[in-house]
């Protein structure tokens, strides 16, 4: 997280830290006592394209709450993970839920309306380009999808699209994604924040919902938008996967 | 009861039989587990006008249900019993309520509207002028009060009133009473039925209410109307008396 | 009004311990009910829970017990209705 | 979500016999509740009564027990709201 705030109060008890076998930090999001969402890209870090979920699972280290180590039983990749950058992690045991460790709810409606502000927490790089020692968070508005597409691909018209990402890497942009823009304070997500939730607080229900999972964390206040997988797009798959595993 | 029906099913579990010390049968009505209503006249049967409630109580025998003898602890006469022909009987023990013994409810509204049909059960004289061996009942409509007054007193105007009862005995008729007429079948109440309830079935609540207590039981299909004490008129006194005793 | 005959009164040695569930606990309660032809009279709801001192307490009336009073005006076999 | 600490779990020797009332009987029941940060998941209402066989039974789900599942999205100390 560039800029933003330190999470001094433990306001994001669903935030997990995932460390790859070559020691890269990324994010994951607790969605019930035994399952977390993260990105497929996070899971494949330092693995070849041919790696299987079985190859990946033992190479990961995962922490919840205040650096509480939890053991991973299995990883399940989204069947279309090249377009839907998502994977599920199942823990060996259910975590004990308390004020430091609590899942975020999955939404029954789509909160990703333009201008809606979400909170994104993360263990990723900060303004010094170092991985942060303390969990940080930033508040970002949902962006106009067409503007985001134009920003990264030059046009919304397939025939006119051309790689235009200001950071050199192109995000996956499709009907399963939404974008959230930098705030006016040049605050943004950055490397290592992927896998974290775009958390929306429904004031009526006083409940926090995972509206998106950060997929493209390379904007780092250079490009204008982070890109998130829409949780409503993957919800049926999530529920089916959990039920079957 | 003249005419009417035998109570073959035990439909009037609030009906009690009271026998005076000179063996006259009258009625009483169970209104809770320990108290019954009857008429003051019933209580004074074969007692002088100067008799007190304490004198009367030991002289009475009382049966509920299927000839179940119950012991009387005390009698309380209405403070204005010459105009409001009512007394209360308190039992030594609470009766056990079952399908044969059950109090009737006291009404929270006045059901004594002209034409309303009530059920009057009783152990009084039948068409042979004998006290009945089996409880009987009759269905009678509430009568127009002015017609009833004219029937017994010739006029509703005080200056013109004159004793006119076809049976020679004048009923007490005032704001605390209502009349119920003979049915077209020449069915009626008769001697010994006094103290019994004019029971109205509230169909909405499926509950039976004691709308009146038969006071004048001498019509016997000769005079046209039986006369009843309105229970709504005595309700406050009943509740106060029970609470204090 | 239901009879209480189909409910086992608790034996003097108390009631069997209910099964435990993870992350949960049980709150014991008794509901006072009345036998046939009686109805509950109480300012509470007739439900009493066990407090720390192992007393049965109702949230509205404390340890004051309800009473069963006779039902009135509900004969088992009422007279046939007026035609 | 309330913690269960303020309710005495029933001792192994069962629960104290509630006082009797005239013409009445008691129906024993337990309400399953969940500790802090958990909520009850059940198709019933979490209330189980003792049947004739001294089994704890819920009228909707029989002897199937409820579960306490984690509450989601209710942090104790939420981030300050969006201005």
């Amino acid at each position: 997280i560039l800029g933003g705030h330190l999470d001094a109060k433990g306001s994001f008890p669903w935030q997990a830290k995932m460390v790859s076998h070559h020691n890269l930090t990324t994010g994951a999001t607790l969605i019930n006592e035994q399952w977390l969402l993260t990105t497929a890209k996070n899971l494949f870090l330092n693995h070849s394209e041919n790696a299987t979920a079985k190859d990946i699972a033992p190479t990961l280290t995962l922490y919840v709450g205040k650096k509480q180590l939890v053991e991973i039983e299995k990883v399940v990749l989204h069947p279309n993970y090249s377009q839907v950058d998502i994977g599920l992690i199942k823990l060996k045991q259910k975590v004990s839920v308390n004020e430091r460790v609590m899942p975020i709810c999955l939404p029954s409606k789509d909160y990703a309306e333009v201008g809606r502000v979400g909170y994104v927490s993360g263990w990723g790089r900060n303004a010094n380009f170092k991985f942060t020692d303390h969990l940080k968070y930033v508040m970002l508005p949902v962006a106009d999808q067409d503007q985001c597409i134009r920003h990264y691909e030059g046009s919304t018209v397939p025939e006119k699209k051309t790689p235009k990402s200001p950071v050199g890497v192109q995000p996956i942009l499709n009907e399963h994604t939404f974008c959230a823009g930098m705030s006016k304070y040049q605050e943004d997500t950055c490397y290592g924040d992927a896998g974290s939730a775009f958390a929306v607080h429904d004031l009526e229900e006083d409940t926090w919902y995972a509206t998106g999972i950060l997929s493209f964390d390379k904007s780092c206040a250079v490009a204008e938008y982070g890109v998130y997988v829409k949780v409503t797009s993957i919800q049926d798959w999530v529920q089916k996967t959990i039920a079957e595993n | 009861i003249l005419g009417g029906h035998l109570d073959a099913k035990g439909s009037f579990p609030w009906q009690a039989k009271m026998v005076s010390h000179h063996n006259l049968t009258t009625g009483a009505t169970l209104i809770n587990e320990q108290w019954l209503l009857t008429t003051a006249k019933n209580l004074f049967l074969n007692h002088s006008e100067n008799a007190t409630a304490k004198d009367i109580a030991p002289t009475l025998t009382l049966y509920v249900g299927k000839k179940q003898l119950v012991e009387i602890e005390k009698v309380v006469l209405h403070p204005n019993y010459s105009q409001v022909d009512i007394g209360l009987i308190k039992l030594k023990q609470k009766v056990s309520v079952n399908e044969r013994v059950m109090p009737i409810c006291l009404p929270s509204k006045d059901y004594a509207e002209v034409g309303r049909v009530g059920y009057v059960s009783g152990w009084g004289r039948n068409a042979n002028f004998k006290f009945t061996d089996h409880l009987k009942y009759v269905m009678l409509p509430v009568a127009d009060q002015d017609q009833c007054i004219r029937h017994y007193e010739g006029s509703t105007v005080p200056e013109k009133k004159t004793p006119k009862s076809p049976v020679g005995v004048q009923p007490i008729l005032n704001e605390h009473t209502f009349c119920a007429g003979m049915s077209k079948y020449q069915e009626d109440t008769c001697y010994g039925d006094a103290g019994s309830a004019f029971a109205v079935h509230d169909l909405e609540e499926d509950t039976w209410y004691a709308t009146g207590i038969l006071s004048f039981d001498k019509s016997c299909a000769v005079a046209e109307y039986g006369v009843y004490v309105k229970v709504t008129s005595i309700q406050d006194w009943v509740q106060k008396t029970i609470a204090e005793n | 009004v239901d009879s209480g005959n189909d409910v086992t009164d608790i034996a003097d040695d108390g009631c069997p311990k209910p099964p435990e569930i993870a992350h949960g606990y049980v709150e014991h309660s008794v509901r006072y009910q009345c036998k046939n032809y009686y109805k509950l009279r109480t300012e509470g709801d007739g439900v009493y829970t066990l407090n720390n001192e192992k007393q049965w307490i109702n949230k509205a009336v404390g340890d004051k017990l309800p009473e069963c009073e006779a039902v009135c005006g509900k004969p088992k076999n009422p007279a046939n209705p007026v035609q | 979500v309330d913690s269960g600490n303020d309710v005495t779990d029933i001792a192994d020797d069962g629960c104290p016999k509630p006082p009797e009332i005239a013409h009445g009987y008691v129906e024993h029941s337990v309400r399953y509740q969940c500790k802090n940060y958990y909520k009850l998941r059940t198709e019933g209402d979490g209330v189980y009564t003792l049947n004739n066989e001294k089994q704890w039974i819920n009228k909707a789900v029989g002897d199937k027990l409820p579960e306490c599942e984690a509450v989601c999205g209710k942090p104790k100390n939420p981030a300050n709201p969006v201005q």
């Epitope: 067409d146 134009r150 046009s155 919304t156 018209v157 397939p158 025939e159 006119k160 009907e175 | - | - | -």
Partner: antibody, heavy 118, light 107 residues
Framework: QVQLQQSGPELVKPGASVKLSCKAS????????INWVKQRPGQGLEWIGW????????KYNANFKGRATLTVDTSSSTVYMEIHSLTSEDSAVYFC????????????WGQGTTLTVS | DIQMTQTTSSLSASLGDRVTISCRAS??????LNWYQQKPDGTVKLLIY???RLYSAVPSRFSGSGSGTDYSLTISNLEQEDIAMYFC?????????FGGGTKLEIK
């Protein structure tokens, strides 16, 4: 407000050429593609091609490539379409229309120019 | 080229009716489907772009839906001014292609 004003009706002989014009106003001319669309009497619509005024780049439907040429004059905010070797099949109404980069839709259309080849 | 088919060439409906016009593509066009209205005087207007997005100032009684190869335009409460020809257009692949049109008339 946005307007696309097309040139008047044309009556030409087979084998000749014709140059139709489309003058834009009410918006930043160089920022939006201009598309050309053909409609024969009582028939559907057929896309001919687009031109991007900022750099003059073009895309054509293969059915028209070589016979239709799109050009631009940014000084007058005008786009032109020239069609060569006309036949009776070219008799139609020709529309110019602006592409706002809304997923390949066109939002403002000219009133159309009727071309009769006879 | 991608073929766009509007099977119903003309449609008769009463004022106030709910009317649905359909359009089928010869292959998956990934929601790149736009709808246009052409009035009897020849003027053309954009109604819906990218399957379901309502163009600005278009009345909300118009709506679009669909995915893959099957798409539709719905007018929820037909008004006199809606009498026109309706065309669909795909913008997934060049060349852009249009449906043959559906003429909407009043009964």
């Amino acid at each position: 407000q946005v307007q696309l004003q097309q040139s008047g009706p044309e009556l030409v002989k087979p084998g000749a050429s014709v140059k139709l014009s489309c003058k834009a106003s009410g918006y930043t001319f160089i920022s939006y593609d201009i598309n050309w669309v053909k409609q024969r009497p009582g028939q559907g619509l057929e896309w001919i091609g687009w031109i991007y005024p900022r750099d003059g780049s073009t895309k054509y439907n293969a059915n028209f490539k070589g016979r239709a040429t799109l050009t631009v004059d940014t000084s007058s905010s005008t786009v032109y379409m020239e069609i060569h070797s006309l036949t009776s099949e070219d008799s139609a109404v020709y529309f110019c229309a602006r592409d706002p980069d809304y997923y390949g839709s066109v939002d403002y259309w000219g009133q159309g120019t009727t071309l009769t080849v006879s | 080229d991608i073929q766009m088919t509007q099977t119903t060439s003309s449609l008769s409906a009463s004022l106030g009716d709910r009317v649905t016009i359909s359009c089928r593509a010869s292959q998956d066009i990934r929601k790149y489907l736009n709808w246009y209205q052409q009035k009897p005087d020849g003027t053309v207007k954009l109604l819906i772009y990218y399957t379901s997005r309502l163009y600005s100032a278009v009345p909300s009684r118009f709506s679009g839906s669909g995915s893959g190869t099957d798409y539709s335009l719905t007018i929820s409460n037909l008004e006199q001014e809606d009498i026109a020809m309706y065309f669909c257009q795909q913008s997934d692949r060049l060349p852009y292609t249009f449906g043959g049109g559906t003429k909407l008339e009043i009964k």
